[in-house]
């Protein structure tokens, strides 16, 4: 008799999820000497314990605490780059500017980047068919709670000047409902963070507007100022040139505005 299985609205667990997490962990710990001590099999055990056998709409931050503990990592608190809706460029940037870090440059972020996972209540099976969608099913699902947990911790760790890359091509350049807008902004510590500097990335070749004057950026400035953190904003008119100049800062064309 086939078991009845809950059908969720979102895609199922990424195929070969355990193997992928383990392989990423091995690769990360080989590349980052400061994380060599991490036992990847224990990391996977903690990961599986966070969501397997649990109802995928009933996951809590507490479920991820053993994983958080094993993945504890110190990144330079003044070298943190947050991003919203512009992940690829943020990652390209930190690949060049090696002393800056996005969440996905940390072990836990690297393990889970672009993956989906969920289990089923009371079985030790991984659900490869479907997982809850944040909007259509529930917000307390394994993936959303994971990112909320690691994002909160990442923001809490930040200090001095924190940078955030925002997508100037979107209708809401700053979106209060994004992870940045709903979690990270509210977990920056005013006693540690002096300034949040937004980099607004332009999409169009001929787009010369000052997107720092956008109403949503003003809203972000207001939220940040109320938290006793200074705010500054820069337009990045030419992201391709911006990356090129990060790679080759001595290039003569890099003295002009990018």
């Amino acid at each position: 008799v086939p078991r009845w299985r809950q059908q969720w609205s979102g895609p199922g667990t990424t195929k070969r999820f355990p193997e992928t997490v383990l392989a990423r962990c091995v690769k990360y710990t080989e590349i980052h000497p400061e994380m060599r001590h991490v036992d990847c099999q224990s990391v996977w055990d903690a990961f599986k314990g966070a969501f397997i056998s649990k109802h995928p709409c009933n996951i809590t931050e507490e479920d991820y605490q053993p994983l958080m503990k094993l993945g504890t990592q110190t990144v330079p608190c003044n070298k943190i780059l947050l991003w919203s809706r512009i992940k690829d460029l943020a990652h390209q940037f930190t690949q060049v500017q090696r002393d800056m870090f996005t969440l996905e440059d940390t072990l836990l972020g690297y393990l889970a980047d672009d993956l989906t996972w969920c289990g089923e209540f009371n079985t030790s099976k991984i659900n490869y068919q479907s997982c809850p969608d944040w909007r259509k099913d529930c917000s307390n699902n394994p993936v959303s709670v994971f990112w909320k947990t690691v994002s909160r911790r990442f923001a809490e760790a930040a200090c001095d000047v924190v940078h955030v890359m925002l997508n100037g091509s979107r209708s809401k350049i700053f979106d209060k409902n994004s992870t940045f807008g709903s979690v990270e902004v509210h977990n920056l510590q005013p006693e540690k963070v002096q300034t949040l500097e937004a980099w607004v990335i332009h999409g169009g070749r001929e787009d010369s507007r000052d997107l720092c004057q956008d109403p949503t950026i003003k809203e972000l400035e207001s939220i940040i100022s109320k938290r006793n953190i200074q705010f500054s904003c820069k337009n990045i008119y030419r992201p391709d040139k911006f990356l090129q100049c990060v790679k080759n800062p001595e290039d003569s064309s890099c003295t002009s505005e990018i």
């Epitope: 193997e19 383990l22 091995v26 224990s42 599986k48 314990g49 991984i126």
Partner: antibody, heavy 120, light 107 residues
Framework: QVQLVQSGAEVKKPGSSVKVSCKAS????????FSWVRQAPGQGLEWMGR????????NSAQKFQGRVTITADKSTSTAYMDLSSLRSEDTAVYYC?????????????WGQGTLVTVSS | DIQMTQSPSSLSASVGDRVTITCRAS??????LAWYQQKPEKAPKSLIY???SLQSGVPSRFSGSGSGTDFTLTISSLQPEDFATYYC?????????FGQGTKVEIK
């Protein structure tokens, strides 16, 4: 039919090393992990460590760290357990046991065991 | 390390008896618990995994229950071939640990 076939009994001197092998057949070797579990005479079961051949990684119980090396050879579908600096308390039957990489289930298949006797 | 404590360490029973063995973990292990049967001079054999799931090919007289820290293995009607030693084992975290075993003997 899955089978784990272990190497034969060994008699070793204190201070020496022993290497026990476990050859797997009847399943996809790289889809599984292999643990080593030992049992001293008249005693219970004691987990020593685990290797994931597909990833080439192993871990071990703190008690054995520095003395045990667990490896696997994918080309021959064989897992190995090397225990060094042997002492009389290491006299035991050593079993290899298989579980899935994700460790979502039990040790579903076991080798027949290898008796290692440490005696001067 | 997680300690696994089984009780009793041995018991005497007759064919047809209902037998219950308990296993307690020193900290919560959710349902990451397996039960094994071992006969003299043989390798252990898996009976139950995920605390209550029956391993393929194992008779239905064996059942498991519990979650968190307290677990039970029940043999509903003891058969002659069931006289053996039974071990619980947690696979919640490393190192994997076993209970000390419960020997089921003929009364």
């Amino acid at each position: 039919q899955v089978q784990l076939v272990q190497s034969g009994a060994e008699v070793k001197k204190p201070g020496s090393s022993v290497k026990v092998s476990c050859k797997a057949s009847g399943g996809t070797f790289s889809s599984y992990a292999f643990s080593w579990v030992r049992q001293a005479p008249g005693q219970g079961l004691e987990w020593m460590g685990r290797v994931i051949p597909h990833l080439g990684i192993a871990n071990s119980a703190q008690k054995f760290q520095g003395r045990v090396t667990i490896t696997a050879d994918k080309s021959t579908s064989t897992a190995y357990m090397d225990l060094s600096s042997l002492r009389s308390e290491d006299t035991a039957v050593y079993y290899c046991a298989r579980d899935d990489i994700a460790a979502l289930g039990p040790f579903d298949y076991w080798g027949q065991g290898t008796l290692v006797t440490v005696s001067s | 390390d997680i300690q696994m404590t089984q009780s009793p360490s041995s018991l005497s029973a007759s064919v047809g008896d209902r037998v219950t063995i308990t296993c307690r973990a020193s900290q919560g292990i959710s349902s990451w618990l397996a039960w094994y049967q071992q006969k003299p001079e043989k390798a252990p054999k898996s009976l139950i995994y995920a605390a209550s799931s029956l391993q393929s090919g194992v008779p239905s007289r064996f059942s498991g229950s519990g979650s968190g820290t307290d677990f039970t293995l029940t043999i509903s009607s003891l058969q002659p071939e069931d006289f053996a030693t039974y071990y619980c084992q947690q696979y919640n975290s490393y190192p994997r640990t076993f209970g000390q075993g419960t020997k089921v003997e003929i009364k």
